[in-house]
């Protein structure tokens, strides 16, 4: 109770009371002091006596404490994908008896839902409400409507507002759990078929067969097939077990194999399902190609005269395919070039670039040439090799080695002498000239003898026909 100070300038004090008069109530000196923050209702009882009659005992005085903020309470809720739910107590509650009775109590939407809308039951359904009255909530006219998107959660924030007494609630957030619904059918996006070798087993690549579904994972997209007309479908790791279903996830993992049997052109009919919706009547085409085999004939040995140029010929190198491929499409690649000379093209003789590719047709035309480069040291016979790779897609590549034999023993039209040097001699008329090693050198005959033993040997020139216009 408020009691005045003894002196005029002394401030009034607050004293707890056991009794008070009607006059004290009338003058506003009896106060209720709220001291427990979370307790919003209270009561006390009185015995009222006037001195005239029997006192009134146990008069109950009930108190409602008005919180500083409107006590708006929220409860999270679930809604099916694309579904709706009425926002009514107990999902949305203003506790206590006082605030819900205020005519001006309204709710403001501070943050609207991202994947849905707050709508009035009978109002326009275009967009979300920005505010609505508590009366509408009580009459169950406000609902949350999910937009049907493939989202698992949504949220919105509300704040209560009592305009007539300038009070508000704290912002209250609602979390909406969206229960997914399998409402989207699977769509076959790619069905290009498969090309493979006859009799082979090959994966059905995801690039050849793919489907999508907005609300199903790849492991839930199931292809169910009928009898393939030219083979069998098996899973990697179980080639002996034929299967009639596989998933997009298995295709993505390269686990679905087609094993070809029978006709070259065929495939299988299939249906596509996500467990809820089925898309029937599809066909996956499997086209098998007969294996093209490359073969290499010819001696694969080239005999070259020292220091000369020799064309490769069909006797040396002759490629063909089981499909009768055009020689222009039989391609050789030089994997490792010659060590003792060079390979070049007759029409594109550039001394710089080494020849890397040539065709069988060019071999037939005699346009691929091997040129032997004379070494500084004499030799009788030398061996070179060329490593080639024959290719003609779609056949498998074939490796080939071309052996080159460079020998003084061979009959060489470009080089009549078998000797390392036999240049002949220029002699002025009536005079003499020295025959030196620069003009006549048969040391290549000793090239096969190991160096340490060469001193034990010598080359003997025996004159079988003497000069007729001079003498040795």
């Amino acid at each position: 109770m408020v009691s005045r100070g003894a002196l005029a300038d002394e401030p009034p004090s607050l004293d707890p009371v056991q009794s008070f008069s009607q006059e004290a109530v009338d003058t506003g000196r009896v106060l209720y002091l709220h001291s427990r923050p979370e307790a919003w209702s209270d009561a006390f009882s009185l015995d009222v006596a006037s001195g005239l009659g029997a006192p009134l005992e146990g008069v109950l005085v009930e108190l409602e404490v008005l919180p500083a903020a409107i006590p708006l309470e929220a409860q999270n809720f679930s809604v099916p994908e694309g579904g709706s739910l009425t926002l009514a107590p107990p999902l949305l509650r203003v506790s206590g008896p006082y605030f819900p009775t205020l005519l001006g109590l309204s709710l403001q939407v501070l943050e609207p839902p991202q994947h849905g809308a707050l709508q009035k039951e009978d109002g326009p359904q275009a967009r979300t409400l920005s505010a609505f009255s508590w009366r509408m909530v009580e009459e169950q006219l406000i609902r949350y409507v999910h937009d049907g998107s493939e989202t698992l959660t949504d949220s919105f924030v509300l704040m209560a507002n009592a305009s007539e007494m300038d009070r508000q609630s704290h912002p209250v957030a609602f979390t909406v759990t969206v229960l997914p619904v399998n409402d989207q059918p699977p769509i076959l996006t790619t069905n290009t078929g498969l090309q493979m070798w006859e009799g082979a087993t090959a994966p059905i690549p995801a690039e050849a067969l793919r489907s999508t579904d907005g609300d199903s994972g790849s492991e839930d997209l199931v292809y169910t097939i009928e009898q393939p007309s030219n083979g069998r479908v098996v899973l990697r790791g179980a080639p002996g077990t034929e299967v009639r279903s596989f998933t997009q996830a298995q295709l993505d993992g390269g686990l679905v194999l087609f094993s070809h049997r029978g006709t070259l052109d065929g495939g299988f009919r299939f249906r596509l399902s996500d467990g809820e919706h089925t898309s029937p009547g599809h066909f996956f085409r499997v086209t098998a190609q007969k294996q093209v085999l490359l073969s290499l004939k010819g001696s694969q040995t080239l005999t070259v005269c020292p220091g000369s140029v020799q064309p490769l010929s069909s006797q040396t190198l002759r490629a063909s395919s089981s499909a009768g491929t055009d020689p222009q499409l039989l391609l050789y690649r030089v994997v490792r070039g010659p060590q003792l000379g060079r390979l070049f093209h007759a029409q594109q003789d550039s001394t710089g670039e080494a020849l890397v590719n040539f065709t069988q047709a060019e071999v037939y035309a005699g346009n691929i040439l091997y040129e032997h480069e004379m070494p500084p040291e004499p030799f009788w016979e030398a061996h070179d090799t060329l490593e080639l790779q024959l290719s003609s897609p779609p056949a498998r590549d074939v490796a080939a080695t071309l052996a080159v034999a460079v020998s003084f023993e061979a009959a060489c039209p470009q080089r009549p002498s078998h000797l390392w040097k036999n240049k002949g001699l220029w002699v002025p008329e009536g005079q003499r000239a020295r025959i030196t090693v620069a003009a006549l050198d048969a040391s290549n005959l000793l090239a096969s003898v190991p160096s340490p033993q060469r001193s034990e040997h010598d080359v003997l020139f025996q004159v079988t026909q003497f000069p007729s216009r001079g003498q040795l």
Epitope: P228, S229, T241, E242, V243, R244, S245, F246, T247, S273
Partner: antibody, heavy 113, light 107 residues
Framework: QVQLVQSGPEVKKPGASVKISCKAS????????MHWVKKAPGQGLKWLGW????????TYADDFKGRFTITLDTSARTVYLEISSLRSEDTATYFC??????WGQGTLLTVSS | EIVLTQSPATLSVSPGETVTLSCRAS??????LHWYQQKSGLSPRLLIK???DSISGIPARFSGSGSGTDYTLTINSVEPEDEGIYYC?????????FGQGTKLEIK
């Protein structure tokens, strides 16, 4: 309409061979696999094997590998089940079926000495 | 091979009752499961294919459900002519296999 007609009942001695036929009509024969099922007295259905009617490739259940052979005559639209070295336990009704729905009427094979 | 286990082995019900037959596979069979009814001396009759697809000419009281490894055949308001043995068949991978069967008796 679709029909699978099987050959008539057979009575054979142990050690002999038998060839049961199943003739299809009313659909594209090479579109659907043909299966054989065994139903022995007092027992359930047992899947025996099937043949790919497009490729002619048969597949057998483990219990039926060896003495059982499934073959095909595409021009006659007929599938055959041949059982060699017959035993008394081969006594049963053998059904052919195609694409789940279509079943033959069954062929009763009795193996008895 | 995939093993199919049917339950119960035998079932005795009165006309009008609803019956649920179960078929469990030893691994996922991607709904490649078909239900058959066989009456004594007759060929099996397809009731449901691919787990839940209905068959024309089969009464609507027969329905199928399930996925993965667990499948169910439901017969609503059983009739006396429904007596027989019911088999499930998996057609997912070779060898195809039947369940051991459920015998349905009508009281």
């Amino acid at each position: 309409q679709v029909q699978l007609v099987q050959s008539g009942p057979e009575v054979k001695k142990p050690g002999a061979s038998v060839k049961i036929s199943c003739k299809a009509s009313g659909y594209t024969f090479t579109d659907y696999s043909m299966h054989w099922v065994k139903k022995a007295p007092g027992q359930g259905l047992k899947w025996l094997g099937w043949i790919n009617t497009a490729t002619g490739e048969p597949t057998y259940a483990d219990d039926f590998k060896g003495r059982f052979t499934i073959t095909l005559d595409t021009s006659a639209r007929t599938v055959y089940l041949e059982i060699s070295s017959l035993r008394s336990e081969d006594t049963a009704t053998y059904f052919c079926f195609s694409y789940y729905d279509y079943w033959g009427q069954g062929t009763l094979l009795t193996v008895s000495s | 091979e995939i093993v199919l286990t049917q339950s119960p082995a035998t079932l005795s019900v009165s006309p009008g009752e609803t019956v649920t037959l179960s078929c469990r596979a030893s691994q996922t069979i991607y709904k490649n499961l078909h239900w058959y009814q066989q009456k004594s001396g007759l060929s099996p009759r397809l009731l449901i294919k691919y787990g839940s697809d209905s068959i024309s000419g089969i009464p609507a009281r027969f329905s199928g459900s399930g996925s993965g490894t667990d499948y169910t055949l439901t017969i609503n308001s059983v009739e006396p002519e429904d007596e027989g043995i019911y088999y499930c068949l998996q057609g997912y991978s070779t060898p195809w296999t039947f369940g051991q069967g459920t015998k349905l008796e009508i009281k």
